[in-house]
């Protein structure tokens, strides 16, 4: 039996700059029941506070609801592990909520096979920003990627689309079924997970319908 190992704050992420969650890796428990507490202060302020919500985001996590989330403030976050034999504290993590945004994936992905005047076929991929994203006010601006592959292929083909919420994919094989996903990233944040997969078959004998 021994004091607990040093916990490590794994990551902090916000879906929308309005709430955020931090997760930690516990380290060894020293063979004893061990309690974990997350404490934080804000840069330039003296007070230290304990995590407001250990439940919402699951085990080894702390959820900061709107009430506890400030932007333009740096949070200094530590996790403390305690058992009968002693305690240990993680290295502090400095968090600016503006820089930890990991949004939900884009929504309303639509796929349509179309044809140019020269009869060249393409796949028109369109989508919308994630629901929470207030793109129009400039609170968020998102960049996007799409990825696609034929059902037979092993590797995805990735296309960066910048701030555009549509993309035309050329040089697809007739008769093949293609899988498509999108993801997004805010100016100062992380890529979302890839969104729901959609599929479409490129017809063998595609003719433009009026």
């Amino acid at each position: 039996q021994s004091p607990p190992g040093k916990p490590e704050i794994h990551k902090c992420r916000s879906p929308d700059k309005e709430t955020f969650t931090c997760w930690w890796n516990p380290g060894s428990d020293g063979g004893l029941p061990t309690n974990y507490s997350l404490t934080y202060s804000k840069e330039g302020e003296k007070n230290t506070y304990e995590c407001p919500d250990y439940k919402t985001s699951g085990p080894n996590s702390c959820f900061f609801s709107k009430q506890y989330t400030s932007i333009w403030k740096i949070y200094i976050i530590t996790v403390n592990a305690t058992n009968e034999m002693g305690s240990s504290t993680s290295d502090p993590l400095y968090v600016d909520v503006t820089y930890i945004v990991e949004p939900e994936p884009p929504r309303n992905l639509t796929l349509e096979v179309k044809q140019l005047k020269d009869k060249k076929t393409y796949l028109w991929v369109k989508w919308l920003p994630p629901t929470i994203t207030d793109v129009k006010t400039g609170w968020f601006t998102m960049e996007y990627e799409i990825r696609l592959k034929s059902e037979e292929a092993d590797e995805w083909e990735i296309h960066f689309t910048g701030h555009q919420t549509q993309f035309k994919v050329f040089d697809l094989y007739p008769g093949q079924k293609y899988l498509v996903q999108t993801r997004c990233k805010p100016d100062h944040g992380y890529w979302s997970r890839w969104g729901q997969e959609k599929s479409i078959e490129i017809p063998n004998d595609f003719t433009l319908k009026d």
């Epitope: 601006t141 990735i158 910048g162 701030h163 993309f167 035309k168």
Partner: antibody, heavy 120, light 107 residues
Amino acid sequence: EVQLVQSGAEVKKPGASVKVSCKASGYTFTDYNIHWVRQAPGQGLEWMGYIYPNNDGTGYNQKFKSRVTMTTDTSTSTAYMELRSLRSDDTAVYYCARGDGNYVGDMDYWGQGTTVTVSS
Amino acid sequence: DIQMTQSPSSLSASVGDRVTITCRASENIYSYLAWYQQKPGKPPKLLVYNAKTLAEGVPSRFSGSGSGTDFTLTISSLQPEDFATYYCQHHYATPFTFGQGTKLEIK
């Protein structure tokens, strides 16, 4: 016919700011990205960033991020690039260029260039 | 950031020659490569995008090839108006970067 017409040459002192304009015509302004690229005397091309006029989304080269602002005025189909805290090594020809309507980063039409000279 | 390396940096050739310029990316950029031609005092002109697609109005003596990290621009039969500086540029993801340029001169 697609055209990008840029504002005239500028001479600035170190520490000042410059704002270059780029007026687009011959296409739907909000459908295409506008990129800004610069070229120092006798040097190669350096990408500074881009703006998508449809939603004013921007992507900047980290090298310039703290000093540059790209904006658009959709009512006049004009893009602007402001560079602050000018230094002598910012002396260059600044180009605006239209991004391809599908692929973001290739530039199919270019402005004539605006010469910015930074000198004390 | 993705680095783009062009070779050669300069090249002397004669009218009618076949000329190849190469460009190497520091990581996989799939087919997201563009080629530009620039003449003194003028803005660059797009020749090729997506590694091999000729831009509108570009003569068929220009062609692009390659994917992944290695790319080439070929001029099948040099014309007097082709003497210029050529730049490659990746358009895979921001920041977009250019090669250092290849100056094509008359021998």
